[in-house]
Interface confidence: low
């Protein structure tokens, strides 16, 4: 049938951060090419990444249409140079991915401290509201827009001269904390979705310390 050198894809894996979503699989093709299809549980299959020799396919454009849906993808294997050829059952070989629900499973990207401002013994720390690839009315929504109150940020802060760190949380993108006058503090933030069972937390942001350029100081 001309498919003897065609093997089914395996290790299909979703890689998704802030809704940027890529399906990866193995093996690297030798005598074959791949096409990916994606659908919701109740929807039609849509083909992407036609006859590619890549072992990944960016499915972001599809999943951002409704990040609360559950998606299934499948990877078809075709003989290189003979993509009309099918397997022994009359269809090309394919393998299904695990199910993927972006809203519940996309990884939270590493947040960034946008700025901090000290006024007397208080410091206001602002977390950058990162833009996602989810769109509404032709504009890209921020992480806060998409997750609403499901998303919180945890602030870790400590005196420059000390190892003991304190924590604070916010349901917005700003923290207002009390500090000791004359002391320099360092800050790191983490995005958290407490209601999740998996991928609840992002990695910590880069550490920012007072006395560096992101800070403003007022008496």
């Amino acid at each position: 049938s001309g498919t003897t050198n065609t093997v089914a894809a395996y290790n299909l894996t979703w890689k998704s951060t802030n809704f940027k979503t890529i399906l990866e699989w193995e093996p690297k093709p030798v005598n074959q090419v791949y096409t990916v299809q994606i659908s919701t549980k109740s929807g039609d299959w849509k083909s992407k990444c036609f006859y590619t020799t890549d072992t990944e396919c960016d499915l972001t454009d599809e999943i951002v249409k409704d990040v609360k849906q559950t998606y299934l993808a499948r990877v078809f294997s075709y003989p290189a140079g003979n993509v009309e050829s099918t397997g022994s059952a009359g269809e090309p070989l394919y393998e299904n991915s695990p199910e993927f629900t972006p809203y519940l499973e996309t990884n939270l990207g590493q947040p960034t401290i946008q700025s901090f401002e000290q006024v007397g013994t208080k410091v206001n720390v602002t977390v950058e509201d990162e833009r996602t690839l989810v769109r509404r009315n032709n504009t890209f929504l921020s992480l806060r827009d998409v997750f609403g109150k499901d998303l919180i940020y945890t602030l870790y802060y400590w005196k420059d001269s000390s190892t003991g760190r304190k924590t604070n949380t916010t349901h917005t993108n700003e923290f207002l904390i009390d500090v000791d006058k004359g002391e320099n503090y360092c800050f790191s933030v983490q995005a958290v979705i407490p209601s999740r069972t998996v991928n609840r937390k992002s990695t910590d942001s880069p550490v920012e310390c007072m006395g560096q350029e992101k800070g403003e100081f007022r008496e």
């Epitope: 951002v64 609360k68 989810v134 009315n137 827009d145 609403g148 109150k149």
Partner: antibody, heavy 125, light 108 residues
Framework: QVQLQESGPGLVKPSQTLSLTCTVS?????????WSWIRQHPGKGLEWIGE???????RYNPSLKSRVTISVDTSKNQFSLKLSSVTAADTAVYYC??????????????????WGKGTTVTVSS | EIVLTQSPGTLSLSPGERATLSCRAS???????LAWYQQKPGQAPRLLIY???SRATGIPDRFSGSGSGTDFTLTISRLEPEDFAVYYC?????????FGGGTKVEIK
Amino acid sequence: QVQLQESGPGLVKPSQTLSLTCTVSGGSISSGQYWSWIRQHPGKGLEWIGEIYYSGSTRYNPSLKSRVTISVDTSKNQFSLKLSSVTAADTAVYYCARDTPYYYDGGYYYYMDVWGKGTTVTVSS
Amino acid sequence: EIVLTQSPGTLSLSPGERATLSCRASQSVSSSYLAWYQQKPGQAPRLLIYGASSRATGIPDRFSGSGSGTDFTLTISRLEPEDFAVYYCQQVGVVPYTFGGGTKVEIK
């Protein structure tokens, strides 16, 4: 449809604790909404006191935070407000409301779509 | 705290006229979090508009909302007798959630 009903004493003495309960009928308190308390001083505007999610997580108005506790009892489909150390300035109509996250086209909208009728609380000795 | 300033404080109009109510925020508010309410004496507020421009269920189409960032507007295209009331804007995006001071629409 969902209805809310506030209940509690209409008269509270200064320095005591004001306690109100909001009973949710026609729907489950655990259905994914937030539940708020708002008050309105006589002849004045509206002031948000705080809110609770059915899981128990709360947010409070910082101006009242040191005196406010909001709790939820999912088994009774109720949530409650306690405001300690009351003064005459706490005399108001107290409303409970449902703060609905409405998911549409990739993101959330929030609004208070269901309100109780309100209960008048007077702080006086 | 986000301060919402409503203007005018009072609007005196006749039935059939157009009412334009303004709500200005002290800092930018995502339209997802901006709502308008109507309140009549002795009653609880009633949701009119959410998401700055979407009408709530059962609200007549003479009510419309617009705006973004710091400037929002509620428009009543033709006032009906039942529309004379106090109108509040509200933001539910940043704690503490805040209401404007209200605009009273009264019969001229």
